[in-house]
Interface confidence: medium
């Protein structure tokens, strides 16, 4: 489908959220990685959000282009442009059967438009199943859930999160592929809005069943550190965050809804170039322990939890955190063992409705970013306890930081 | 309160021209797509043409060339210029605002429309 | 283009009694399917959208389900003003697409 004069310059329908009316954009600044060396002979990969900045050794220039990283949640490997893998992580959409393959025209015709899509798999992200996702024309797939109104801009999985405008070209496409073991989004020919003589992006982001995720880069026509991220964030990587309700101050019988960005991985926009690949393969996490013993005697670099009422296993830092408030699971745990649960009955679960989110020890990892419901200034909320930059780098992933309470 | 209100149909012969008029109120029209969605006598709705807050444009096939969408944010109105007339282009046309909001980075998502006009009768015959 | 489907064209149903209306899409739309309520005379109404979330204002008897090429709207049990005609619509892909309509007709 062709747009018409004037189309692709704008919103169009694509689908997703639900709510009635307008509800302002939630104008997000982008903050920066550092971007520092520590040393002259390693290459910092990425700002991990979760365990501080993370400079790992690298051979020399001439003998390797890999670069791997440890980001508590994922591990991930930079292939450059010289490396065989590269080639083999990337998709060939064009071969693979027409039938699993759909080129999404609203989203191909657009600006600014996502669209959401059922996953023919339960992909783990952040070691949740999640089945829908929604794609963005702007490089990047909310992993948030839409239906209640959720999709934030902390649940991302981004290969090249710009301002693309697929409307711009008839040949810009959005493209994706789901065979029952792996989702791609291939992002073709799309140009940059207001850059459009730099050329088209041709890249991909792959979500593997088992977790992994894959981003593959074909045709990057420029420098990403020179893409402006005036008009939009510019950046590579992942993040997950958790929402919580609080009680509202002005109105005692509403809830507040603060969104806690727990993790996040930012690449090194100057490593994404022509032909290069990066792969995350998923770490253990708490939520993958099915028993208390499993839970317990896990060695993963979580501490993880055991809550008899929702036989769980959990650090208290994911999406279900505030269930592990509600039901009182941070003050179950402390102290006892697995078999001083073997006589209770967890069938009988009910919120502990005099426990209070206040009550619970939410501290950060490191960083955090709040996004309060009910501001109407900017959205984002750095925590205050941290460096200027919002960044604690000197703490590693289970260092607790600052307890911070959610809400204004 | 939130109202569309349709104006400009009736009767036109095969060939010939209408232009159809859509003042909305009680919302911010400039943030909104608007469409037009047509009913023929006693059929379904059919879905003709979108025109996004930017004046992006898209039609149906069955309209694609005859009928042109626009729209004046200062004047809170949608237009629909139908020419090149036909017998099948008979029916009720609506007026529709788009069911949407923005999210994250000011992504915007669509999800029906959520607001109609009474709709006017466009006839085309000799 | 993406063609729906419903079935059945006419429904007759007592007042009290639960309908069920079927609407099928020619390919996936995922969950991007609204239902629409139209009462003669009347411009229709938006009654679910994302295939299974309300609109505002929209008694809880209306329920919708389905994703991918199969959806349902329930109306739990029918009232006097629920008699009307009922149109699902696709939003995953251009052109935006309608079902022909099932009629609910007092039995």
């Known amino acids: 489908l062709s747009p018409q004069p004037g189309a692709g310059h704008d919103e169009g329908p694509g689908s997703g959220w639900a709510a009635k009316g307008t509800v302002r954009g939630w104008n997000r600044r982008a903050r920066e990685s550092p971007g520092h060396v520590s040393e002259p002979d390693r290459t910092q990969l990425s700002q991990d959000l979760g365990g501080g900045t993370l400079a790992m050794d690298t051979l020399p220039d001439n003998r390797t282009r890999v670069v791997e990283d440890n980001h508590s949640y994922y591990v991930s490997r930079l292939y450059g442009p010289s490396e065989p893998h590269s080639r083999e992580l990337w998709v060939d959409v064009a071969e693979a059967n027409r039938s699993q393959v759909k080129i999404h025209t609203i989203l191909s015709n657009t600006h600014r438009q996502a669209s959401r899509v059922v996953l023919s798999f339960d992909f783990p992200f952040y070691g949740h199943p999640l089945r829908q996702i929604t794609i963005a024309t702007g490089g990047f797939i909310f992993m948030g859930d839409v239906i209640h109104r959720m999709l934030t801009a902390t649940q991302y999985v981004a290969p090249l999160m710009a301002n693309f405008n697929p409307g711009y070209s008839d040949n810009s496409t959005v493209v994706y592929f789901d065979n029952g073991t792996v989702f791609v989004v291939q992002w073709d020919h799309v140009y940059l809005q207001g850059w459009e003589d730099k050329g088209s992006f041709t890249f991909q982001a792959a979500l593997h069943h088992d977790g992994r995720i894959v981003f593959a880069y074909k045709e990057i026509p420029m420098s990403v550190p020179e893409i402006s991220s005036s008009q939009h964030p510019v950046k590579t990587g992942l993040s997950d965050a958790f929402m919580i309700l609080n009680p509202s101050p002005d109105v005692p019988e509403s809830r507040r809804r603060s969104i806690f960005e727990y993790h996040r991985i930012e690449l090194d926009p100057s490593k994404v170039t022509s032909m290069s690949a990066v792969e995350f393969t998923p770490l253990p996490t708490c939520l993958q322990h099915r028993s208390c013993d499993a839970c317990m005697s896990s060695d993963l670099t979580f501490n993880c939890s055991w809550c008899h009422v929702l036989q769980r296993c959990s650090s208290g830092f994911d999406r279900y955190r505030q269930e592990w408030m509600d039901y009182g699971c941070a003050q179950e745990a402390e102290g006892r063992m697995c078999e001083d649960f073997q006589d209770e009955d967890h069938d009988s679960a009910s919120p502990d409705t005099s426990f209070s989110p206040y009550d619970g020890d939410l501290t950060t990892t490191s960083s955090s970013l709040f996004i309060d419901s009910l501001t109407t200034e900017d959205d984002t909320k750095l925590n205050p306890y941290a460096g200027g930059d919002g960044l604690q780098n000197n703490l590693s992933p289970k260092t607790k930081g600052t307890p911070v309470h959610l809400g204004t | 309160e939130v109202q569309l209100l349709e104006s400009g149909g009736g009767l036109v012969q095969p060939g010939g021209s209408l232009r159809l008029s859509c003042a909305a109120s009680?919302?911010?029209?400039?943030?909104?797509?608007m469409s037009w969605v047509r009913q023929a006598p006693g059929k379904g709705l059919e879905w003709v043409s979108t025109?996004?807050?930017?004046?992006?444009?898209y039609y149906a096939d069955s309209v694609k060339g005859r009928f042109t969408i626009s729209r004046d944010n200062s004047k809170n109105t949608l237009y629909l210029q139908m020419n090149s007339l036909r017998a099948e282009d008979t029916a009720v046309y609506y007026c529709?605002?788009?069911?949407?909001?923005?999210?994250?980075?000011?992504?915007?998502?669509?999800?029906?429309?959520?607001?109609w006009g009474q709709g006017t009768l466009v006839t085309v015959s000799s | 283009e993406i063609v729906m489907t419903q079935s059945p064209a006419t429904l007759s149903v007592s007042p009290g009694e639960r309908a069920t209306l079927s609407c099928r899409a020619s390919?996936?739309?995922?969950?991007?399917l609204a239902w629409y309520q139209q009462k003669p005379g009347q411009a229709p109404r938006l009654l679910i959208y994302?295939?299974?979330t309300r609109a505002t204002g929209i008694p809880a008897r209306f329920s919708g389900s389905g994703s991918g090429t199969e959806f349902t709207l329930t109306i739990s049990s029918l009232q006097s003003e629920d008699f009307a005609v009922y149109y699902c619509?696709?939003?995953?892909?251009?052109?935006?697409?309608f079902g022909q309509g099932t009629k609910v007709e007092i039995k």
């Open positions: 529709a605002r788009d069911a949407s909001w923005y999210g994250p980075f000011s992504y915007y998502y669509y999800y029906g429309f959520d607001v």
């Open positions: 994302d295939a299974s």
């Open positions: 390919q996936s739309v995922y969950t991007n």
């Open positions: 025109i996004y807050r930017g004046a992006g444009t």
């Open positions: 009680g919302f911010t029209f400039s943030n909104y797509a």
């Open positions: 619509q696709q939003y995953n892909d251009w052109p935006l697409t």
